[in-house]
């Protein structure tokens, strides 16, 4: 007879969940030779038992301690790109601007982008049913407190100027209740921190808007300098342009604005 | 009750300098962007300058580029338009404005305005 | 001259509805907000209509505002003789990177 499972409202564990882990940790030491030290089967072990047999609503972030420990890593702390409902393009633009870094181009990140995981309490078992989703379960599910605990130490990092890109197609260019808006924000060292730059990215039909005026990003800058960091903003009209210019910064036509 | 509050108008030559001062109260200065807009005697409305909350965005109008200069001091709740190599067509009534909440280019918040003349 | 085209005047009796136009291009009216403020003469500015066609608390009303493609308008219905200002549009100009009013339009209240 099967036992009985609890039914959560999110999608449940991506298949072949530990082997993906594992995996994708092989393959991002055998690529960046810094983490080459980097034990991976250590580094599933201490993913698994931050969540296996815990209820997945009762997550916390020193579940996922030892998991930060075997994954510290170094970035270029001057080079940090946080983005915030505009992923796809901020990872094509750091393949191509390898000298800069998204969360997911660190060891951690890459582990974990696009999966979902969560076990249940009291057994050794992974639900591949469903997981709790973050508003109609709990927030303090497996996933929700992995990407707020790695985001946080990514923001805490960073030094200089920080660069982020946001999605000018949104309703809400800047969402206080993003990953970005809720974590990063509030993780940037004032002591470190000298600028953000926020780069807004235009989408669909070319358009003349300045969204560097959008409210939202009024009221992002207000608690930006409120942290004693200064900011800036950027619109990137054109994507396609943008991304190409990176590739090809001496085309002639990558000087007028993008 | 927000108010603003122009001063440092006068009358200058041309080529000489003056800083208008624009005094805010009412309201918290520090969340607000904030603008520069004049008006020649008998004539309309022209935008001069805007400036963000933690001064990282500026714009100015072609007309006052590269001679003019807006400022703020937050912990003054002032705004400042810096103004140099002044000529006769910069003459006119100097107004500081406010941006409206949740809003892109509106300005609820009008100062009475300060006169600056530039003749010789 | 201006990058937002207004007629220079406009007049109506009390009780009637005017309407003032403002015709601008891509760069501004179209890809941006509209504005609409109210001068009376020796006063400030007033800001009247926001984002094409919102009314800011204590504005009245009579007082609309509406967009299509690169033209704008605001409508005064049930004239006033305190109607009597210079009205003036102003949006954001993508091309010259910066805030544009129109050239004003003088209402009389006949």
């Known amino acids: 007879v099967p036992r009985w499972r609890q039914q959560w409202s999110g999608p449940g564990t991506t298949k072949r969940f530990p082997e993906t882990v594992l995996a994708r940790c092989v393959k991002y030491t055998e690529i960046h030779p810094e983490m080459r030290h980097v034990d991976c089967q250590s580094v599933w072990d201490a993913f698994k038992g931050a969540f296996i047999s815990k209820h997945p609503c009762n997550i916390t972030e020193e579940d996922y301690q030892p998991l930060m420990k075997l994954g510290t890593q170094t970035v270029p702390c001057n080079k940090i790109l946080l983005w915030s409902r505009i992923k796809d393009l901020a990872h094509q633009f750091t393949q191509v601007q390898r000298d800069m870094f998204t969360l997911e181009d660190t060891l951690l990140g890459y582990l974990a982008d696009d999966l979902t995981w969560c076990g249940e309490f009291n057994t050794s078992k992974i639900n591949y049913q469903s997981c709790p989703d973050w508003r109609k379960d709990c927030s303090n599910n497996p996933v929700s407190v992995f990407w707020k605990t790695v985001s946080r130490r990514f923001a805490e990092a960073a030094c200089d100027v920080v660069h982020v890109m946001l999605n000018g197609s949104r309703s809400k260019i800047f969402d206080k209740n993003s990953t970005f808006g809720s974590v990063e924000v509030h993780n940037l060292q004032p002591e470190k921190v000298q600028t953000l730059e926020a780069w807004v990215i235009h989408g669909g039909r070319e358009d003349s808007r300045d969204l560097c005026q959008d409210p939202t990003i009024k009221e992002l800058e207000s608690i930006i300098s409120k942290r004693n960091i200064q900011f800036s903003c950027k619109n990137i009209y054109r994507p396609d342009k943008f991304l190409q210019c990176v590739k090809n910064p001496e085309d002639s036509s990558c000087t007028s604005e993008i | 009750e927000v108010q603003l509050l122009e001063s440092g108008g006068g009358l200058v030559q041309p080529g000489g300098s003056l800083r208008l001062s624009c005094a805010a109260s009412?309201?918290?200065?520090?969340?607000?962007?904030m603008n520069w807009v004049r008006q020649a005697p008998g004539k309309g409305l022209e935008w001069v300058s805007t400036i963000s909350i933690s001064g990282g965005i500026i714009y100015y109008a072609d007309s006052v580029k590269g001679r003019f200069t807006i400022s703020r001091d937050n912990s003054k709740n002032t705004l400042y338009l810096q103004m140099n190599s002044l000529r006769a067509e910069d003459t006119a009534v100097y107004y500081c404005?406010?941006?409206?909440?949740?809003?892109?280019?509106?300005?609820?918040?009008w100062g009475q305005g300060t006169t600056v003349t530039v003749s010789s | 001259q201006s990058v937002l085209t207004q007629p220079p005047s406009a007049s109506g009796t009390p009780g009637q509805r005017v309407t003032i136009s403002c015709s601008g291009s891509?760069?501004?009216?179209?890809?941006?907000?509209v504005y609409w403020y109210q001068q009376v003469p020796g006063t400030a500015p007033k800001l009247l209509i926001y984002?094409?066609?919102q009314r800011p608390s204590g504005v009245p009303d009579r007082f609309s505002g509406s967009k299509s493609g690169t033209s704008a308008s605001l409508a005064i219905s049930g004239l006033q003789s305190d109607d009597e200002a210079d009205y003036y549009c102003?949006?954001?100009?993508?091309?010259?990177?910066?805030?544009?009013f129109g050239g004003g339009t003088k209402l009389t209240v006949l």
């Open positions: 102003a949006t954001w100009d993508g091309s010259l990177n910066g805030r544009v």
């Open positions: 984002k094409d066609d």
């Open positions: 404005a406010k941006d409206n909440w949740n809003d892109y280019y509106g300005m609820d918040v």
């Open positions: 891509t760069s501004n009216i179209r890809d941006n907000y």
């Open positions: 009412g309201f918290t200065f520090s969340d607000y962007w």
